[in-house]
C-alpha cells in the first residue's frame, strides 16, 4: 500500500489550532511537476457535507513530503470530509478522514467501520443531545432509512447493514429530523472486496495474517498497519511516538501522539495513534490494552509486562507476541519483512535461525508462493545462530508474493513470512529530448517516461554518430539533471539513446528507442581586418590579419585566404586551419601577376564576411645578377667591392644585397643592403683581421634577383677583432636579416 | 631606410581642429596597414587609430570616434589623422605606426597640445 | 576590450643584474603578444613580437615567453642602455591595447 497517513489534531478547544497534515512516505512524493510524481493534495470535499463558506483555507507545503490545512476560523468550519491524495500513477491513493463536531446532537460511536464482503455491519449513534424527533440516516448524501425517535436502544441509535458489499462503502450520517446537518454524526463505512481472509481477483488468495489490527488489502494482500506498527504482517511495533510504514515519521510536539486521529489508506480507515483512545484519542490506555484505539489485549505469559505501545515485553528465555514461546523452540532471527529484487535476477537469500537443538543447513528450508520448496546451498554456523543461504532460481514476475522461511527441530518450528517484491527494470518509452545544440555540443534532457519500476538511481546517455559502427560512447548522469554531450563533431548527426536503471543488481533496463540530433554549425560573423602583406620573392607573400574584438568563444574553425587573379580568371584558395592564426606564408604564386586578396573565417562548411579586398602586385621575376663582381682588401677590417649592373634590366633596381660569409665558416651569412642602386662599388667595414671572406651579391627590383659570382678575400693582418662587418659608415640594422 | 616623419603637431585651442601627417619611406608603403598611438605626458601608450593597407577599412578608439578620421594617400606614401572637438584630454605625443602583426616601425612622434 | 596588467610597476636593478618583467592578459590573447622598449624623449621600438620572436637587430640578452594571459620578458644581464620603459601589447584583436608600462631604473 501507499506510504500515505492523514493526520488530524483533535485538540479543540480552539479551531484556529485545528490542523491537518498529509504526509508521505513514499519516494519521490509531492516533488511537483516532474516526471517523478504529482504533488500531494489536502483538501476538504465538500460534495458529501456541505458547510457555510468562510475564508479559505490554508495550504502549506513542508518540504517535498508534507502538506498542512490551516486557517479553520469556527468549529462548524471543522466539520465534514477531508481527503489527501498522493502516490503516483496506477499507485494514486485517497486517504479520507471524516470530523464530527463534538457539540452535535449524535456522536458516532466509532466513526470508521472496516468489515469484510458479505458481513453485517452495525452503525451506532450516541445521542448526545436529546430532539424528540426522527432520525434519518443518509448514505453518501442520499435518503437511506429513518428511525422514531422511540427506537433507540440504551441511549443510542442504530443502524444494521446486513450482507454488505463493496457499492455500499461510503459516507453515512444520522440527523435528528429539522435539525442542521452539522449537527450530525457521520460514519465512514469501508467494505473491503472480499471475505475475511481472502485477498486478490476472485479472493482465491490468503491473507498473510495481519497482526496487531493491521487490515489485508483486498487488492494486493499487504497489511496495511495501524500507525505504530510496521513490518510485512505489522508483527514489529515502532518506538513510541512514531508512525509511518517504516516507522519513519515522527509525531509533532512534546506529548508525541496524543490528540491526533490517524488516517491510513483503505481498508484501514481512521483510528488513534497507537497508546491513546478516545474521542479526541487524548486518553491512555487501560492497563492491558495496546496498540492503536487501545483495541488489542497483551495477555501476556510468562512474567511478559504489558507496554501500551508494543504490545507484552517478554523476559529474557520468552519471545512470541504473548511471551508463549520458549526460546529453545527454534526461532527465525532477524528475518527482513520485504525484500526487493529485479526481474530475471538470481539472488542470495539468507535465513538465520536459533533453537536448542542448533538448527543444522537441512532444517532450514524457503517456500515460494507457488509451493515450491528451496533447499539451501550452505550454512555457515555460528556460536548463536545457523545461517542458510539459498540461490534462488532466475526471478520472474509471478514470483511476486509472500515467501516463508520454516525452521524444523525436535525442539518445534518456526517460521516467517515475508514479502518479496520483483520489480521490472525501467525502459524508456520515449527518446531523450533535445534542448540546445551547438557546433561541438549537445544538451539533452534524459528524464523521460518508462514501462517498469522505479525508482530511477541511474540515468546513462548512449550516443554515437549516425551510421558509425564505431563502439558507443556512454555518459551516467544524475537523473534530475540536464545533460550536455561534449567533444562532438560539428555539423554531425548522433544517435542518442537512454538507458534507465533502478537500484540493485540487474536493475538496468533495455536500452530506449534511438533519436538523431544534429550539431549545430553557426555561422562565423567576425570579419577579418586585412593588416597587410610583406611580398617575400617574386612567387611569396606573406600575409597578416587580425580580428576585431567579440564577448565569447571565437566561432570559427580557420581562415580562408583567396587570391583572384582577374588576368586568367583563376582564383587560388589557401586554407589556414587554425582560428588562432593572424599570418600566412602563401608559396607559388606566378610572378609579375595582380591580384586581389581577401580573408574569411569559416566554421564547418560555412564562411563568414570578407575582409575588403587587396589589390596586390606581385613583381616580375627578379632582375639578372650583378657582373663582374670584384673584392679588394683596403685594411685589416676593410674590403672593397665593386661590380657592373645587371643587364637587360625590367625596371629600376629599389636596392643591392650583399651576402658576407667567413670562408669554411659554419655560422649564417650575413646580409648587408646597399640602398643606393646606383653605386658600383661599397666598403664593407668592420671585419676580422688576417680572416678569409667570401661575397656574392644579387639586385632587388620588387622582388629579389639572381646571386653573382662568388668572390674571395682576405683582410690584412694583426687587427683587433672587429664588432662585425658593416657597409660604408652606416650600421645596416634595417637591412640586416639572418 | 625605412622611416616614418610625422608633422602637424601644434598647440590648439579647446574644440579646434589638427590635421596630422605622416609621410613613409623605405618600404612599399600600400602594402600595410597604418596606425596612430598616443601618449600623454607621463603616461602609458593608447592605440588612437588604425588603416588597412588600400585605406577601404578603419578602426577608432572609443575616445576618438566620431572626432577623429584617419586615411591615407597611397600615391604620396602618407598618412593622416584629422582631429576636431579637441578637448584637452587628447594632450599627447602622437606617433604614427606601421602594422605588421605588431607595431613595427615608429616614427619620431609629434606634440599636440589642446589649451586654453 | 582585453585589459593587459604589467608587473612590477617599477624595478630597481644594477647593470649585469636579470629582470624578469611580467604582463597578464584578461582573456587569452594566444600567443600575440609583443613587447616594446622606450627611452624618454624616444618613440617605442619594438623587441618582441608573437610572444618569443626577437625583432630584427634586438640583442639577445632580450627573450619573451608565454602564452594565453600570463607573459614574461626576461633581460638576462642588464646594460646600460637598457633602463627604459617597457610595455607589453596584444594584437590578437582589435582594440589593440598596452599594459600601463613597466619601468627599469638603475638602483
Known amino acids: 500500500a501507499v506510504d500515505l497517513t492523514l493526520l488530524a489534531n483533535l485538540r479543540l478547544t480552539d479551531p484556529q489550532r485545528f490542523f491537518l497534515t498529509c504526509v508521505s512516505g513514499e519516494a519521490g512524493a509531492g516533488r511537483g511537476s516532474d516526471a517523478w510524481g504529482p504533488p500531494l493534495l489536502l483538501e476538504k470535499d465538500d460534495r458529501i457535507v456541505r458547510t457555510p463558506p468562510g475564508p479559505p483555507l490554508r495550504l502549506a507545503r513542508n518540504g517535498s513530503h508534507q502538506v498542512t490545512l490551516r486557517g479553520f476560523s469556527k468549529p462548524s468550519d471543522l466539520v465534514g470530509v477531508f481527503s489527501c491524495v498522493g502516490g503516483a500513477g496506477a499507485r494514486r491513493t485517497r486517504v479520507i478522514y471524516v470530523h464530527n463536531s463534538p457539540g452535535a446532537h449524535l456522536l458516532p460511536d466509532k466513526v470508521t467501520h472496516t468489515v469484510n464482503k458479505g458481513d453485517t455491519a452495525v452503525l451506532s449513534a450516541r445521542v448526545h443531545k436529546e430532539k424528540q424527533t426522527d432520525v434519518i440516516w443518509k448514505s453518501n448524501g442520499s435518503y437511506f432509512y429513518t428511525l422514531d425517535w422511540h427506537e433507540a436502544q440504551d441511549g443510542r441509535f442504530l443502524l444494521q447493514l446486513p450482507n454488505v458489499q463493496p457499492p455500499s462503502s461510503g459516507i453515512y450520517s444520522a440527523t435528528y429530523l429539522e435539525a442542521s446537518p452539522l449537527g450530525s454524526a457521520f460514519f465512514r463505512l469501508i467494505v473491503r472486496g472480499c471475505g475475511a481472509g481472502r485477498w486478490g481477483p476472485g479472493c482465491t488468495k490468503e491473507c498473510p495474517g495481519c497482526l496487531h489490527g493491521g487490515v489485508c488489502h483486498d487488492h494486493d494482500g499487504e497489511c496495511v498497519c495501524p500507525p505504530g506498527f510496521t513490518g510485512t504482517r505489522c508483527e514489529q511495533a515502532c518506538r513510541e511516538g512514531r508512525f509511518g510504514q517504516s516507522c519513519q515519521e515522527q509525531c509533532p510536539g512534546i506529548s508525541g501522539c496524543r490528540g491526533l486521529t490517524f488516517c491510513l489508506p483503505d481498508p484501514y480507515g481512521c483510528s488513534c495513534g497507537s497508546g491513546w483512545r478516545g474521542s479526541q484519542c487524548q486518553e491512555a490506555c487501560a492497563p492491558g490494552h495496546f496498540g492503536a484505539d487501545c483495541r488489542l489485549q497483551c495477555q501476556c505469559q510468562n512474567g511478559g509486562t504489558c507496554d501500551r505501545f508494543s504490545g507484552c515485553v517478554c523476559p529474557s528465555g520468552w519471545h512470541g507476541v504473548h511471551c508463549e514461546k520458549s526460546d529453545r523452540i527454534p526461532q527465525i532471527l532477524n528475518m527482513a519483512s520485504e525484500l526487493e529484487f529485479n526481474l530475471e535476477t538470481m539472488p542470495r537469500i539468507n535465513c538465520a535461525a536459533a533453537g536448542n537443538p542448533f538448527p543444522v543447513r537441512g532444517s532450514i528450508e524457503l517456500r515460494k508462493p507457488d509451493g515450491t520448496v528451496l533447499l539451501s546451498t550452505k550454512a555457515i554456523v555460528e556460536p548463536e545462530k545457523t545461517t542458510a543461504e539459498f540461490e534462488v532460481p532466475r526471478l520472474v514476475l509471478a514470483d511476486s508474493g509472500f515467501w516463508e522461511c520454516r525452521v524444523s527441530t525436535s525442539g518445534g518450528q518456526d517460521s516467517r513470512r515475508f514479502k518479496v517484491n520483483v520489480k521490472v527494470p525501467p525502459v524508456p518509452l520515449a527518446a531523450p529530448r533535445l534542448l540546445t545544440k551547438q557546433s561541438r555540443q549537445l544538451v539533452v534532457s534524459p528524464l523521460v517516461s518508462f514501462s517498469g519500476d522505479g525508482p530511477i538511481s541511474t540515468v546513462r546517455l548512449h550516443y554515437r554518430p549516425q551510421d558509425s559502427t564505431m563502439d558507443w560512447s556512454t555518459i551516467v548522469v544524475d537523473p534530475s539533471e540536464n545533460v550536455t554531450l561534449m567533444n562532438l563533431r560539428p555539423k554531425t548527426g548522433y544517435s542518442v539513446r537512454v538507458q534507465l536503471s533502478r537500484p540493485g543488481e540487474g536493475g538496468e533496463g533495455a536500452w530506449g528507442p534511438p533519436t538523431l540530433m544534429t550539431t549545430d554549425c553557426p555561422e562565423p560573423l567576425l570579419q577579418p581586418w586585412l593588416e597587410g602583406w610583406h611580398v617575400e620573392g617574386t612567387d611569396r607573400l606573406r600575409v597578416s590579419w587580425s580580428l576585431p574584438l567579440v564577448p565569447g568563444p571565437l566561432v570559427g574553425d580557420g581562415f580562408l585566404l583567396r587570391l583572384w587573379d582577374g588576368t586568367r580568371g583563376q582564383e587560388r584558395r589557401e586554407n589556414v586551419s587554425s582560428p588562432q592564426a593572424r599570418t600566412a606564408l602563401l608559396t607559388g604564386l606566378t610572378p609579375g601577376t595582380h591580384y586581389q586578396l581577401d580573408v574569411q573565417l569559416y566554421h564547418c562548411t560555412l564562411l563568414g564576411p570578407a575582409s575588403p579586398p587587396a589589390h596586390v602586385l606581385l613583381p616580375p621575376s627578379g632582375p639578372p645578377a650583378p657582373r663582374h663582381l670584384h673584392a679588394q682588401a683596403l685594411s685589416d677590417s676593410e674590403i672593397q667591392l665593386t661590380w657592373k649592373h645587371p643587364e637587360a634590366l625590367p625596371g629600376p633596381i629599389s636596392k643591392y644585397v650583399v651576402e658576407v660569409q667567413v670562408a669554411g665558416g659554419a655560422g649564417d651569412p650575413l646580409w648587408i643592403d646597399v640602398d643606393r642602386p646606383e653605386e658600383t662599388s661599397t666598403i664593407i667595414r668592420g671585419l676580422n683581421a688576417s680572416t678569409r671572406y667570401l661575397f656574392r651579391m644579387r639586385a632587388s627590383i620588387q622582388g629579389l634577383g639572381d646571386w653573382s659570382n662568388t668572390v674571395e678575400e682576405s683582410t690584412l693582418g694583426n687587427g683587433l677583432q672587429a664588432e662585425g662587418p658593416v657597409q660604408e659608415s652606416r650600421a645596416a640594422e634595417e637591412g640586416l636579416d639572418q | 631606410e625605412v622611416q616614418l616623419l610625422e608633422s602637424g603637431g601644434g598647440l590648439v585651442q579647446p574644440g579646434g581642429s589638427l590635421r596630422l601627417s605622416c609621410a613613409a619611406s623605405?618600404?612599399?608603403?600600400?602594402?600595410?596597414?597604418m596606425t596612430w598611438v598616443r601618449q600623454a605626458p607621463g603616461k602609458g601608450l593608447e592605440w588612437v587609430s588604425v588603416i588597412g593597407p588600400s585605406g577601404g577599412n578603419t578602426m577608432y578608439a572609443d575616445s576618438v570616434k566620431g572626432r577623429f578620421t584617419i586615411s591615407r594617400d597611397n600615391s604620396k606614401n602618407t598618412l593622416y589623422l584629422q582631429m576636431n572637438s579637441l578637448r584637452a584630454e587628447d594632450t599627447a605625443v602622437y606617433y604614427c605606426?606601421?602594422?605588421?602583426?605588431?607595431?613595427?616601425?615608429w616614427g619620431q612622434g609629434t606634440m599636440v597640445t589642446v589649451s586654453s | 576590450d582585453i585589459q593587459m596588467t604589467q608587473s612590477p610597476a617599477t624595478l630597481s636593478l644594477s647593470p649585469g643584474e636579470r629582470a624578469t618583467l611580467s604582463c597578464r592578459a584578461s582573456q587569452s590573447v594566444s600567443s600575440y603578444l609583443a613587447w616594446y622598449q622606450q627611452k624618454p624623449g624616444q618613440a617605442p621600438r619594438l623587441l618582441i613580437y608573437?610572444?618569443?620572436n626577437r625583432a630584427t637587430g634586438i640583442p639577445a640578452r632580450f627573450s619573451g615567453s608565454g602564452s594565453g594571459t600570463d607573459f614574461t620578458l626576461i633581460i638576462s644581464s642588464l646594460e646600460p642602455e637598457d633602463f627604459a620603459v617597457y610595455y607589453c601589447q596584444q594584437r590578437s584583436n582589435w582594440p589593440r591595447t598596452f599594459g600601463q608600462g613597466t619601468k627599469v631604473e638603475i638602483k
Open positions: 608573437d610572444a618569443s
Open positions: 605606426a606601421r602594422v605588421w602583426g605588431a607595431f613595427d616601425i
Open positions: 623605405g618600404f612599399t608603403f600600400s602594402h600595410y596597414g
